[in-house]
Structures are given as C-alpha cells and as structure tokens.
Interface confidence: low
C-alpha cells in the first residue's frame, strides 16, 4: 500500500560532483601540481564564502531571526496531535519538507522506517480498578484527560497509557515505592524489609527517567506498575491548574515510553536501520521492552488508590508527597479495606510502523563533507505545545534564516544538515535509525550535532548542557547576544545566565551540565562521538522543585499554554533561537572549529577527582586488592599538557594553509571521537563514550567515567568483592587507556 | 450518536458505474482518516480503499487501482466511492469505516482495528 521509494544521499552526491569533475579537469589540463591546485581550490572557497565579513554574517543570520515567526510556526505545528506512526504526523513532515525547501535548502528529502510503536487499543481501553473480594469493581480509573476548553472535538487524542506496556490484568495488593528509585528499593527491601515480589506497585513521576523506575519494579518483582503525578512534583504553589494556569490539574495525566533501549533504537533491529530489508527480532528477543504491565494516572484517581493504604508508615517526610493521604507503604489496603486488591486491564499493542524524518541540506561551500547538524523531533504525545514544537518551531525559523542568507548569495563553510526526527517518544528512534544508517559518513565527517526539543521548561534562565569542547563557544556567543530577562535590559545573556544559574566550581561563570540522555543528540554523542550540545530556557531550580514541567505530555500541552503562561512574547523562544542558531552557525562557519580541548582537560581533573573520591570510601579493599587511580591521574596530567601545547600551535599556525588548517580542525573534530570505545561500556554496547553515560539509574542524568562508576556502585553488596574490585581495575585501565590515547591525536603528527 | 450510513448500493451489469456515499455523525469527521472495506458474499473482509483526514492522501488494493476512486466532502461529512468499470468478482456488501484514533497504520493494509463502522450497502454486479 505504501509504496514510497527509500531516499538516499544520492541525490546530495551527484549534484556535488559536476564541480569536482570541472575542476579535476582544469587540473590536468592545466597540468597544475596537486598542491597548487588544492590551495587554489580552498582560497576560491573561501573567498566565495566569506564575501562579506565574518561577523556581518552571524549579525545577519541573528537579525534574521524573528519572535513573530516562531510564534506563528508554534501555533502552526500545534493544531493537531502529531503522534509518531499517524497520518497526521506523515502530513506534517511532508509540509515542513516543503517548506524547507521554500527557505531555500539545497535539498529536503524524507527518509523511512518501520519501527516497533506502540498505541492502545482503541476498543479496549486500558484502566486500573479497586476489587471488592467477589472481584466486583467498586473504582476504576479514568479512561482519558478531560479535553481543554477549545479542543473537545478533536479527534486523533491517544489517552494516556505507557508505550510498549505488555498486555496484561494483573492483580494484588498495592506497595508504595516513592520515587522507585535505585534507593527507594533499597530502603523498602533492606532496611523496611518489604517485599514487593508479586505485587503491584504504585511510584510518583518525577526525579529520574519512567524507564528506570519500571526496570526497578521488575527487578524487586512486582507484576504491575502504576505512574502518578504528585502535586508535590507537578504542582507549584501559588499557581492555578490549567487553563487559569501552568499546573498540572487533577484530572491530567504523564505519557512517555517506559523502554531501557540503552542506545539501541528500534528494540528489534538494534545496531542496524529498519529498512525495507533488516533482520527484525522476535517481539520475546526484541531491545529494552518492559516485561511487566504499567500504566499512568493523575492525581484524583492517584488519591483514591493511596488513601486506602494500609501496612508501614513511610519511612520519612522524602517519601510524601502533597496528596490528603498517609503515603503508607503497604502492602495492601488498611482495615475495613484489606480485602479490597488492585486490578490492572492494559490492553496496549506494540506494532511495526512506518515513521519519517525530514533531512534537510545547506551545502557548505569549502568543506562540504563536513557536517553541522541540527535536529529536534517533530512528533508529540498529543499537541506537543511544549515538547516539541517549541523546538520545531525554533528550527523552523533557523532554516528560514540560513535560507534567506543562501538566497542573497552567502554560502556557510562546511555543510549544515537539518533534521526533524520521528518518534523520538518512542525511545529516540528516528534519529538513531537514521544515524545507524549513516553512522559511517558520520563518523568520519559529523563535527558537531546540536540539539533542538523544547525551547522553554520555563522562563527563568538559559540552560546548557554540552561536550566540554563547546564550552568557550557557549560562553562567547551569550556574551554576544541580549538577555530577554526583566532586570537585565542592555545585559548579556552572559550576564543573566550566570546571576541566575551560577557555576558551582568557578566564579563568575554560568553552570553548564553534562549530556545524558533521554533526547536525540544520544545516538550522536553517546554512541559515534560527536561533539553535541542542548540550549532551552528552564525554571528557577532554586524556588520550582517539581519535576520537569507540571504539564509534561499531557493534553494541556498546548500552544495557549506557551503563549498564555510561560513566552507571551516569543521573547525566550527567540534567544534560544539565537543560541542554537548561533552555535550552528559558528560551527559551520568558523575557520577554525570553535572547541577548545583545554576545557575537557579541565573536566578530567575533576571527574578523575569525583571518581577516586567515591572509591576512596572503601579504603581498606583498594589496599586489598591493589586498586590504584596512579595511571588514570598520569593520563590526565598528560592529556592536560598535550591540550595545552596543542592550543598554542592553535593559536599559532598558518591559518592560510589549507592542509595546516584542515589538519588542525580535524584533529580538534576527532577528538570527541577519541573518547569512543568500540566495545561499548558493560551491558550497554551502544554506550560508548567512556567520559559520559546516561546514568544507569537515571537516563536523564549524565555520569562521568561510567563504567568506574557503575563497577564501584552498591560495591559492598556484591557476593564476590574480589571479582567486583577486579572489573574495578578493569574499569580504570579502559579510562587511563582512553584518556591516553585521546591525548595522543592532539599531539603534533610528525 | 457516533455512526456512519453507507448507501448507493444496488445492481448493476459489468463495466457500468456505481458511486457509493458513507455520511458521518456524531464524530469529527474532518478530522480522521477513513476507510472502504468490503465482504464478498462466504468471504472475509478485504480492504479497498483509504483517504487521509484532509483527502491528500488516497491508497486503492491493486484489485481496483484505476477503477475505483475514493474522495471525501468535508463541509458535508460526507465520504465517497466511484467505481467504475466493474466486475462480477466486485459484488459485496460495501462497508465504510472510521481509522482508528492514532491513525492509519503506516506500511500496512491488512489488520486494521476500526473502531466504526457503517452498516454497509449490497452492490451486486451481474448481467
């Protein structure tokens, strides 16, 4: 029925080709030396390229960019639920490849796979009940949001549920897990002495990724899951429910993904794209599904699972939330309601489906094999007022700009791809496919990837997560731009950030965080080692304790939530327009690649530092067994004065030299390559970089030296400590080894 | 109430033209994809043809491609099937459906989970 042919980067090929073919011949017409040839080749580039200056150029690009527009383009993409695998979200691609091409892109192709997706069944809804002991349901749980004034009739509304829950109606008493986090088990199993084996376990939103509370809760044995948003965490005080404001009403509900892919993309071709001809796994062998039944509520039905609660008391006020009930733990209902059970009725389906990304090109006018890319995803859980379209809404504009630029004869440096991804609340799958597909022409010419999902979590302060390598181009592009923020009128962005979200380490500077995961920049960073980096306005972290944003994936999401309550005047939307955009901008522009390697020396320090702290809490076993971190601290002492040397060479050489030059951005371009272990880190092979790891307790957060860190984790506990300690040392040789030969490419070639 | 009510069923010879209409209530009918399936007579369900929310996109089962096309009128809620040329083998009761609400299922044709149907209208073709 479908019958689409798959695009490839044919097309991109053959049009690059007359150019070189034309001036391959005037090379041996001319019988020109190759040398002379190349230095005529790249100075021609260059000056094509730069035909006004450098700087007019970025303030052209930044001018360009418009809050109106970005405003229009939000309410555009958020008329409709654009769900990953629909008709819908197959239209919107198709009108943003067209309008891309609008801009004035070189070309927009659409590219296709068939994933595992899954959706509820519409004849069969999923819920959750109170049984009396004749199996009578006396409550069930509502079967979808109430619609937000305006959007009652509209259809294509997928109620809350949990993608790629099994099917299944389990049964039992309930035990509370708080967060169900690594340590609220542990506090429940070994110091309250519960068992959740065999029952169904209710755990609030919030603190750490959906996907790791369920592994948590089959790990401890439980057969059922059910997610609540507390008012605690989705709730702030002194602001009114939506539509009078930004909070989450009772009757709204959290989707998400409750996957642990670590990495894998679509969890039946892992390693490989779902093209027409992959090998696709049996659903039994199939990546990071859940193996027990879950599903979400809000928080009225929340209140009357947990107001029965009976059993042990929580064991501190970390473990109650802002719910009228007691947070006991369980098991089971109190008193007159101990016969009462839960009842669980998931009928999901997870389902191959077609998905599609949009790959839009700016070829680069001197070094077109050398790719800046830029990428968000398109498709939401309902309208995505938020996540995402206030990201596709920015990278909308930012095509607009660079095509303007294009269209009056300017051309960047190196080639800028966009993207608009596919099912990435499906577990980041349009980027990963298409990065499986490309990951050879990636690894070899990917110099940056920038992230682009949601522009605002709030309207407080800039938030920067990024590769160290990024750091000084973050800095002085902020320094550049205005803030938006009331009290800071004629102030930097710098300013701002750096009042409102200071470094914890270094005075005077803002706080920029590690990558983790959870977003579509992993496969590039995580996996092939691109250097990549994430902008968005957030809250006051300080004053805001709730969780994400209260009206996270859920059916208030929309675009008046944006355009009421959180950037009436698109004003946030613009800057992080003109951070992201800048940031591309620089990367592909620059003569010289923006990273500065002495800022990744400085996080090795410390990481080495953090890391041999925790282990230095076990002091008596690392003299048993001999575990030194002496290596580790000489390879980053080495990595250190190698940066330090390279980047006075940086300084120094003859930026005129077009082989000096490309060897000086290649060797800064590979080296985020360098961190990348091939074997992977343990159990998660497409976790490679041995720097940075999603958490293993939390696919949000990022963890430096991962693999030490998980081999050191819970140590005490372990049956065998001399072969824990032994993976221990294993752990330290991969990273002194890494960090080692990461240094070496920055050495001098000859 | 939800419902869709096919009509313009009939008999008809071989080659001649017959144009089925499906009209929606009760739902946003502008807003969903729609379906026509239909059931030869001791057969199964076979699907024949699909046209997205806005009618940009149309799908046909290699059986009737060229011969049967499928069109939609939002303002009246109204959804429609021109067949032309037809065969003996297209005599079946003719059912439109409703795609489910996440939307059609890309890549596939077969195993839809429609979640209304019409009643369905009898097109006989004989001489």
């Known amino acids: 029925m479908w019958n689409l042919l798959h695009e490839t980067d044919s097309a991109v090929a053959t049009a690059r080709r007359p150019r070189w073919l034309c001036a391959g011949a005037l090379v041996l017409a001319g019988g020109f030396f190759l040398l002379g040839f190349l230095f005529g080749w790249f100075i021609k580039s260059s000056s094509e390229a730069t035909n006004i200056t450098p700087k007019h150029n970025m303030k052209a690009f930044l001018d360009e960019l418009k809050a109106e527009n970005i405003k229009k383009f939000l309410h555009n993409f958020t008329q409709i639920p654009h769900l990953a695998g629909t008709e819908q979200n197959f239209q919107l691609a198709k009108q943003i490849q067209s309008q891309w091409k609008e801009f004035g892109l070189d070309s927009v192709e659409l590219t296709h796979y068939d994933v595992l997706l899954s959706y509820p069944n519409k004849t069969h809804p999923n819920y959750i009940s109170i049984i009396n002991e004749d199996g009578n349901e006396i409550f069930n749980t509502s079967l979808f949001e109430p619609p937000p004034a305006g959007y009652e009739n509209v259809s294509d509304i997928v109620p809350p549920f949990s993608a790629f829950s099994p099917q299944g109606m389990p049964e039992g008493d309930l035990v509370y897990v708080n967060y169900a986090r690594t340590e609220d088990f542990f506090k429940l199993e070994r110091d309250m002495k519960i068992n959740c084996s065999g029952k169904i376990v209710i755990a609030r939103y919030g603190k750490v990724f959906r996907g790791n509370k369920v592994k948590n809760a089959q790990l401890a044995g439980a057969t059922g899951v059910i997610l609540y948003s507390d008012p605690a965490d989705y709730f702030a005080p002194g602001v009114k429910s939506y539509p009078d404001g930004w909070n989450l009403p009772g009757g709204g509900v959290q989707r998400g993904n409750i996957l642990n892919l670590n990495g894998a993309g679509d969890p039946l071709t892992p390693g490989y794209p779902a093209n027409e001809y992959a090998y696709r796994r049996g659903i039994a062998e199939a990546v990071g599904l859940p193996s027990i039944p879950v599903h979400p509520i809000g928080y009225y039905d929340a209140q009357k699972l947990l107001e029965k609660m009976g059993g042990s008391a929580s064991p501190d006020s970390s473990w109650r939330g802002s719910l009228k009930v007691p947070y006991n733990v369980g098991p089971g209902f109190t008193g007159n309601f101990s016969t009462q059970k839960v009842k669980m009725h998931i009928h999901s389906t997870s389902e191959v489906t077609r998905i599609y990304n949009v790959i839009g090109t700016l070829r680069g006018a001197v070094e077109p094999d050398r790719y800046v890319i830029l990428g968000g995803h398109r498709d939401s859980w309902v309208f995505g007022g938020i996540d995402p379209q206030s990201g596709a809404a920015v990278v909308h504009e930012i095509v607009r700009s660079f095509g303007t630029l294009k269209k009056e004869g300017w051309r960047p440096r190196r080639t800028i791809l966009f993207a608009s991804w596919d099912a990435e609340e499906f577990g980041l799958l349009g980027s990963t496919e298409w990065a499986e597909e490309n990951s050879r022409l990636l690894q070899e010419r990917g110099v940056a990837y920038i992230n682009a999902d949601s522009s605002i979590e709030g309207n407080y302060t800039l938030r920067v997560d990024c590769t160290p390598l990024m750091y000084s181009l973050v800095y002085n592009l902020t320094k550049e731009l205005e803030s938006p923020d009331e009290g800071f009128e004629g102030k930097s962005l710098y300013e701002s950030w750096t009042k409102k979200s200071p470094s914890p380490e270094f005075s005077g500077m803002p706080r920029i965080s590690k990558l983790g995961s959870g977003n579509d920049f992993e496969v590039f960073f995580q996996r092939l080692g691109i250097a990549s980096g994430r902008a968005r306005y957030t809250k006051n972290w300080e004053t805001n304790k709730f969780s994400s944003y209260p009206l996270y994936h859920s059916v208030y999401e929309t675009y008046e939530l944006v355009e009421k309550f959180y950037d009436p005047m698109f004003k946030y939307h613009l800057t992080v327009a003109q951070v992201r955009g800048g940031m591309v901008f620089e990367l592909a522009n620059s003569v010289v690649l923006p990273f500065d390697c002495r800022d990744y020396a400085v996080v090795l320090r410390k990481y080495a530092d953090k890391i041999y702290n925790i282990s230095m809490k076990h002091p008596q076993e690392m003299k048993t067994y001999s575990v030194s971190f002496d290596s580790l601290f000489s390879a980053v002492k080495n990595f250190t004065e190698i940066a330090s040397k390279f980047s006075e060479r940086l300084r120094d050489f003859d930026k005129s030299n077009p082989i000096l030059l490309r060897m000086m951005n290649d060797q800064l371009m590979f080296l985020e390559r360098a961190f990348i272990d091939p074997l992977g880190l343990p159990d998660r092979p497409f976790y490679r970089h041995v720097i940075y790891a999603p958490s293993s307790h939390n696919k949000y957060a990022g963890e430096s030296f991962p693999g030490i860190y998980d081999a050191l984790f819970d140590i005490e506990s372990k049956v065998d400590p001399s072969q824990a300690w032994g993976e221990v040392k294993r752990q330290i040789s991969i990273a002194t080894f890494t960090v080692q030969a990461a240094a070496e490419t920055l050495s001098e070639v000859a | 109430e939800v419902q869709l009510v096919e009509s313009g069923g009939g008999v008809v010879q071989p080659g001649r033209s017959l144009r089925l209409s499906c009209a929606a209530s009760?739902?946003?009918?502008?807003?969903?994809?729609v379906h026509w399936v239909r059931q030869a007579p001791g057969k199964g369900l076979e699907w024949v043809a699909y046209?997205?929310?806005?009618?940009?996109?149309?799908y046909y089962a290699d059986n009737v491609k060229g011969r049967f096309t499928i069109s939609r009128d939002n303002s009246k809620n109204t959804l429609y099937l021109q067949m032309n040329s037809l065969r003996a083998e297209d005599t079946a009761v003719y059912y439109c459906a409703k795609d489910p609400a996440w939307g059609l299922r890309l890549g596939e044709s077969s195993s839809y989970d429609f979640d209304i149907w019409g009643q369905g209208t009898m097109v006989t073709v004989s001489s």
């Open positions: 046209i997205s929310y806005d009618a940009s996109n149309k």
């Open positions: 009760g739902f946003s009918f502008s807003g969903y994809g």
